[in-house]
């Protein structure tokens, strides 16, 4: 039987790292203790329809982040997105896909929202 | 246990400097950032910087670019802070507050905290 | 620098309410929140992180809710230990900021 994925390292980007003064990218390994669980995410922006990111790295144990093996945006048109994800390196490639709301169904189907990758 | 141990309270004059020291004990003091916030009496609290205790490296609020130093020494474990200048608007009681390495990066455990009065 | 917003600045409330207490970002800030709690003449303590996420230890009485700009701290039954001033704090990005500050008093 498979177990979950463990997180021990994750991309990692910081657009602000002149500021912060820390590394702008590379890879993040994830340390911690035995009971927590780590996982990987990444933050966006859309600028007019071009992708900027924001941050990427390990982020602490967080159950919004359990079990999740992409990292996917799921809120409509936030300001910042933002995904999670449990796995090594799985905040590599992040992607858009809002949740519908439910409402009453029409004669003209919605077309899901592009995704965005990395 | 984590612990954060502060030096004790401080009264200094107008335009003289403060440092404040903080020992940090039960974890690995290079695994984790410092941070510094302080409150001045009757206020909120107010972020003025972080070190990062593995590399040495800073950033600093804007208000206090110039006027505040953080170091650190891993031997000890200690981090410092130095605040050069002062006023009587810094007084205010000094934190400093354990921040994890990994986002969000929460403040989860705190100094007892260091008054530092000025005045003349 | 991003302005976080608390409100109520102060709230009076019994053993066993459900207080609320609402924190506003001036801009997006995704999850990057945090709320402590802090009593007269100590150090403020770590609630909650990312929004919603209980810090160890922490009794489940306390929750967190909100992502972006909005963000809400929940003592579902208050007990007398949770009399205090509650503060929210962002880390999205350099200064990190703190909201004003709820106290929580006894009615």
């Known amino acids: 039987i498979l177990g979950r994925s463990e997180t021990q390292e994750c991309l990692f980007f910081n657009a602000n790292w002149e500021k912060d003064r820390t590394n702008q990218t590379g890879v993040e390994p994830c340390y911690g203790d035995k009971d927590k669980r780590r996982h990987c995410f990444a933050t966006w922006k859309n600028i007019s329809g071009s992708i900027e990111i924001v941050k990427q790295g390990c982020w602490l144990d967080d159950i919004n982040c359990y079990d999740r093996t992409d990292c996917v945006e799921k809120k409509d048109s936030p300001e910042v997105y933002f995904c999670c994800c449990e796995g090594n390196m799985c905040n590599e490639k992040f992607s858009y896909f809002p949740e519908m709301e439910v409402t009453q169904p029409t004669s003209n189907p919605v077309t899901p929202k592009p995704p965005y990758y990395n | 246990q984590v612990q954060l141990v502060q030096s004790g309270a401080e009264v200094k004059k107008p335009g003289a400097s403060v440092k404040v020291s903080c020992k940090a004990s039960?974890?690995?003091?290079?695994?984790?950032?410092m941070a510094w916030v302080r409150q001045a009496p009757g206020q909120g609290l107010e972020w003025m910087g972080i070190?990062?205790?593995?590399?040495?490296?800073?950033s600093y609020a804007q208000k206090f670019q110039g006027r505040v130093t953080m170091t650190r020494d891993t031997s000890t474990s200690t981090v410092y802070m130095e605040l050069s200048s002062l006023r009587s608007e810094d007084t205010a009681v000094y934190y400093c507050a354990r921040v994890s390495m990994y986002a969000p990066e929460p403040m989860d455990v705190w100094g007892q905290g260091t008054t530092v009065t000025v005045s003349s | 620098d991003i302005q976080m917003t608390q409100s109520p600045s102060s709230v009076s409330a019994s053993v066993g309410d459900r207080v609320t207490i609402t924190c506003r970002a001036s801009?997006?800030?995704?999850?990057?929140l945090a709320w402590y709690q802090q009593k007269p003449g100590k150090a403020p303590k770590l609630l909650i992180y990312a929004a919603s996420s209980l810090q160890s230890g922490v009794p489940s009485r306390f929750s967190g809710s909100g992502s972006g700009t909005d963000f809400t701290l929940t003592i579902s039954s208050l007990q007398p230990e949770d009399f205090a001033t509650y503060y929210c704090?962002?880390?999205?990005?350099?200064?990190?900021?703190f909201g004003g500050g709820t106290k929580v008093e006894i009615k």
């Open positions: 039960g974890y690995t003091f290079t695994s984790y950032n």
């Open positions: 704090q962002q880390a999205f990005s350099h200064p990190w900021t």
């Open positions: 801009q997006g800030i995704s999850r990057w």
């Open positions: 070190i990062r205790p593995s590399v040495g490296s800073t």
